[in-house]
Interface confidence: medium
């Protein structure tokens, strides 16, 4: 579905880009935390029945993966890629694939990812190089 | 609370017209940008159409440009898509919704949807 509209209105929730198209805002899977079984796999879905229209047209799809002693955890939410998330910046937000980075988290496993695409943060990849196979 | 109740769905032959509405509560309607999204059987969500708070400016996907149009009634807080020239591949759940809702796929919702057949 073409992400532009062809027409410049004055909307908070249809924004005009620089070149005068109108972005939508985003569709995402939005289940904020949810206790999830993705363990050791390269890919997983995330299971979330739950689809959001973002609040703002220029966030983005997000998904979270923590590991503790404890449980797993997948978070599912709209971001606005200009702020950072758990206090890290929200890297390949332009991305079409929601592709996990680790980031540095004391206690726990935490990966993050970030996309732009309809329902991208469904399908959350941990290798690079099996982006284009099917989920575990 | 915000609600949206959508109705006018129902089975067509290809070919019909349908008009859907969208009935709108708890918040400022004239304010909102609203959305038409469908989920057709076993698929995500599309998105459908689009409109601007004051009605104009709109947008339309490509698979129904030309065939559906979209308007409210900012007196009414209600929302229509009139549907004509119907194919079967617009057989589909059909919502309405504003920024920030929330879509329970395959369940009810505040906003349950409205369900379009079109089979012969």
């Known amino acids: 579905i073409p992400p532009h509209v062809p027409k410049s209105v004055n909307s908070d929730v249809m924004a005009s880009d620089n070149g005068g198209a109108v972005k939508l805002p985003q569709l995402c899977k939005f289940c904020d935390v949810r206790l999830s079984t993705c363990d050791n796999q390269k890919s997983c879905m995330s299971n979330c029945s739950i689809t959001a229209i973002c609040e703002k047209p220029h966030e983005v799809c997000v998904a979270v993966w923590r590991k503790n002693d404890k449980n797993i955890t997948l978070e599912t939410v709209c971001h606005d890629p200009k702020l950072t998330y758990h206090g890290f910046t929200l890297e390949d937000a332009a991305s079409p694939k929601c592709v996990m980075k680790e980031k540095k988290r004391a206690g726990e496993t935490f990966f993050m990812c970030a996309c732009n695409m309809e329902e991208c943060n469904d399908y959350i990849i941990f290798s690079e190089e099996y982006t284009t196979s099917s989920p575990d | 609370e915000v609600q949206l109740l959508e109705s006018g769905g129902g089975l067509v032959q290809p070919g019909g017209s349908l008009r859907l509405s969208c009935a709108a509560s708890g918040f400022t309607f004239g304010q909102e940008s609203m959305y038409w999204v469908r989920q057709a059987p076993g698929k995500g969500l599309e998105w459908v159409s689009a409109i601007s708070g004051s009605g104009g400016s709109t947008y339309y996907a490509d698979s129904v440009k030309g065939r559906f149009t979209i308007s409210r009634d900012n007196s009414k807080n209600t929302l229509y898509l009139q549907m004509n020239s119907l194919r079967a591949e617009d057989t589909a759940v059909y919502y309405c919704?504003?920024?920030?809702?929330?879509?329970?796929?395959?369940?009810?919702?505040w906003g349950q949807g409205t369900l379009v057949t079109v089979s012969s």
């Open positions: 919704a504003k920024s920030g809702t929330r879509i329970k796929q395959g369940f009810d919702y």
